[in-house]
């Protein structure tokens, strides 16, 4: 047997001015009903029945999953990072067979030695967090390594990162330049080859928020948009109010349809309201307008 | 672990020798770089010589010709030849050692120290 879904009605008019009977599903939301067993679910857009009600599926909510949020929760990194690959060339150590072996004590000798130096060269950046070193190879000792940034997630946060990857080719040049060799020795805790210094490569952490707020809307993405709010993004419709995107519909009720946000105007005892914002009330009794 | 005992110090007049001894224990003998260093009343420690697995040698200009390091990879031993001496040499003598072939007196490149051993250059 069909189960049969109560609909209820609300008078409200359309910005065009005509008064209408509408369910409170919205007509222009593509339907598709999902069905358990022979029971006809009142699961609407994707949603499922879990054997006590709808779960539906982002962007939509209700009984039935018939009404579009007004926000969808977007969540950005706490912290974003950067990985600049690096190469330097240690002019103050001498290359061993037992540098290649990572899990060698001259390894981790090195290792240690080496990020004690950049963590002296680098201490003015906020944003540094260490070194990780990649490989080592003969020449004295060249040092491929990352240097691994992090700061914590804001709209400026490629800003922030860029500018912190330039103070690092920055203060690995200058120390690469006055720290060399005088006369075969070495005063610093490392010495290197103002030549072998190389910037390889440089991966930034990847987060738009508009992106992910216009995947998650789906086919209402040219709809929703971010707004943000003490530094954090906010996915939205219009028909959220407090932002500077929201749709005020004074005597109505704001829905989102496939075409956009519209205004439902409501129809009282005394006036019923039209206008795209239903901003324009007529008197019942005495017809005329006032704004 | 590595252990790096010092010897040899005493008090000595200006002009006169004296030769430190340093016995390394749980060091890889026939690699790395071991080397001297001296702290001075108040004053910053500092390198005084280094010898490599491969017996290259440098020495800091104040003691140039006049101190020689040697090193004995099979004993694992680090001596320290002091002539000449003069009152400004007086300080604790310390020795120190790297797993790694190193070009570098600074102290923070060294690892492992030895407690130092007290030399005192007095008439």
């Known amino acids: 047997p069909l189960a049969t879904i109560p609909v209820s009605t609300t008078s409200l008019t359309s910005s065009e001015g005509s008064t209408i009977s509408t369910p409170s599903v919205d007509i222009s939301t593509p339907v598709t009903t999902s069905i358990v067993g022979d029971q006809c679910s009142r699961c609407k857009n994707g949603g499922f029945w879990d054997g006590l009600k709808c779960q539906c599926l982002t962007p939509y909510y209700g009984e039935s999953c018939e009404e579009v949020v007004n926000s969808i929760d977007i969540a950005p990194p706490e912290t974003v990072s950067a990985q600049m690959e690096l190469t330097v060339t240690v002019t103050s150590v001498k290359f061993t067979d037992e540098l290649k072996n990572h899990s060698s004590q001259e390894f981790r000798e090195f290792n240690k030695t080496f990020t004690e130096q950049m963590n002296i060269v680098y201490s003015g950046i906020p944003e540094y967090v260490g070194v990780n070193i990649t490989n080592l190879r003969l020449g004295s000792v060249v040092v491929e390594h990352d240097v691994l940034l992090r700061t914590k997630y804001t709209p400026e946060y490629k800003t922030a990162l860029d500018n912190a990857t330039e103070v690092v080719k920055q203060k690995i040049t200058k120390v690469t330049t006055e720290q060399i060799m005088t006369n075969d020795n070495c005063s610093a805790l490392m010495c290197f080859n103002t030549t072998g210094t190389q910037v390889q490569n440089i991966t930034v952490t990847q987060y738009d928020p508009v992106e992910e707020c216009r995947q998650k809307a789906e086919e209402y993405e040219d709809y929703f948009l971010v707004e943000y709010r003490d530094q954090k993004p906010y996915c939205i419709s219009p028909c959220e109010s407090g932002f500077n995107a929201s749709k005020n519909c004074n005597h109505g009720k704001c829905q989102m349809s496939q075409n956009g946000a519209r205004c439902l105007c409501v129809t009282t005892e005394t006036h019923w309201y039209s206008g795209e914002d239903c901003n324009q009330g007529t008197q019942k009794s005495h017809h005329h307008h006032h704004h | 672990d590595v252990q790096l005992v010092e010897s040899g110090g005493g008090l000595v007049q200006p002009g006169g020798s004296l030769r430190l001894s340093c016995a390394a224990s749980?060091?890889?003998?026939?690699?790395?770089?071991m080397a001297w260093f001296r702290q001075a009343p108040g004053k910053e420690r500092e390198g005084v010589a280094f010898i490599n697995s491969d017996g290259r040698t440098s020495y800091a200009e104040s003691v140039k010709g006049r101190f020689t390091i040697s090193r004995d990879n099979a004993l694992s031993s680090l001596w320290l030849q002091m002539n000449s001496l003069r009152a400004e040499d007086t300080a604790v003598y310390y020795c120190?050692?790297?797993?790694?072939?190193?070009?570098?007196?600074?102290?923070?490149?060294?690892?492992?120290w030895g407690q130092g051993t007290m030399v005192t250059v007095s008439s």
């Open positions: 749980g060091f890889p003998s026939s690699r790395g770089t």
């Open positions: 120190a050692a790297s797993l790694l072939y190193l070009m570098t007196v600074n102290a923070a490149a060294y690892p492992y």
